[in-house]
Amino acid sequence: GSTVPPMVNVTCSEVSEGNITVTCRASSFYPRNITLTWRQDGVSLSHNTQQWGDVLPDGNGTYQTWVATRIRQGEEQRFTCYMEHSGNHGTHPVPSGNSHHHHHHHH
């Protein structure tokens, strides 16, 4: 099939001791090959500071996955979710405020 770029959604949730978990979800993409990673100040975080979900079918012939990392509360602006799919990339910042999210269709 033809390339379908991912929808990218960034959320954050409070955790203990002044840290928050930021999660980046990519969905509705095809083919299944994708790079999803967190960057701090423009540079990719090491693998051992991130958790990845499997790339799974979402039932529509497309795929979904996620990556998460824990960061200090108040440092959200230094982090971006970096997505690479079919030769295209996108950078997705962390929204301010826990009730907000960034939901963006990457063209």
Epitope: D41, G42, V43, T80, G87, H89, T91, S96
Partner: antibody, heavy 117, light 107 residues
Framework: EVQLVQSGAEVKKPGASVKVSCKAS????????IEWVRQAPGQGLEWIGA????????NYNEKFKDRATLTADKSTNTAYLELSSLRSEDTAVYFC??????????WGQGTLVTVSS | DIQMTQSPSSLSASVGDRVTITCRAS??????LAWYQQKPGKAPKLLIY???TLADGVPSRFSGSGSGTDFTLTISSLQPEDFATYYC?????????FGQGTKVEIK
């Protein structure tokens, strides 16, 4: 010291192509995205697109998607912008810049491209 | 695309004056806003990022504020070297867009 050094001024005829280079030094070239911006004479700034020098993956402004090609050569720490089918409105100074997370921290000195018959 | 509107487009001021430039986004960009200073024939120079963080080496007379859609750049006491054009830029989503610029001239 982080430095981005761009190629010299170019004069092109309408319909031609131009390739501008941006040589990076003073940091790990493949770790950071390189962005391209242009500025027409007396005008404001316009984002063209970005490239990941490590992978070659690109992100284009839809306005330039059909005519701009971004590439990078890891062996020489150099990023390139090629713009095809030039027209007079493409006369501008073209800048490269390093993307440091969520802003551009270092810029090249700019390359003037003049399109004239 | 998010449109960035700066005001005023130009202003005349004297050395020692307090100068305020505003930038309005057409949508919520959280705090993902940078300010640049540009002098004729030169590349833009980063002044402020994340709406209010001063870049390295930038004098403390420059300050930024705002979040969401409305942002301000203030020069507390204008110096001779501050006469230039100032641009805001949003980093919430691509295409990254700039304000049209504010030219600060000598009165």
């Amino acid at each position: 010291e982080v430095q981005l050094v761009q190629s010299g001024a170019e004069v092109k005829k309408p319909g031609a192509s131009v390739k501008v280079s941006c040589k990076a030094s003073g940091y790990a070239f493949t770790n950071y995205l390189i962005e391209w911006v242009r500025q027409a004479p007396g005008q404001g700034l316009e984002w063209i697109g970005a490239i990941n020098p490590g992978s070659g993956a690109t992100n284009y402004n839809e306005k330039f998607k059909d005519r701009a090609t971004l590439t990078a050569d890891k062996s020489t720490n150099t990023a390139y912008l090629e713009l095809s089918s030039l027209r007079s409105e493409d006369t501008a100074v073209y800048f490269c810049a390093r993307f440091l997370g969520n802003y551009f921290d270092n810029w090249g000195q700019g390359t003037l491209v003049t399109v004239s018959s | 695309d998010i449109q960035m509107t700066q005001s005023p487009s130009s202003l005349s001021a004297s050395v020692g004056d307090r100068v305020t430039i505003t930038c309005r986004a057409s949508g919520n960009i959280h705090s993902y806003l940078a300010w640049y200073q540009q002098k004729p024939g030169k590349a833009p120079k980063l002044l402020i990022y994340y709406a209010e963080t001063l870049a390295d080496g930038v004098p403390s007379r420059f300050s930024g504020s705002g979040s969401g859609t409305d942002f301000t750049l203030t020069i507390s006491s204008l110096q001779p070297e501050d006469f230039a054009t100032y641009y805001c830029q949003q980093f919430w989503t691509t295409p990254y867009t700039f304000g049209q610029g504010t030219k600060v001239e000598i009165k």
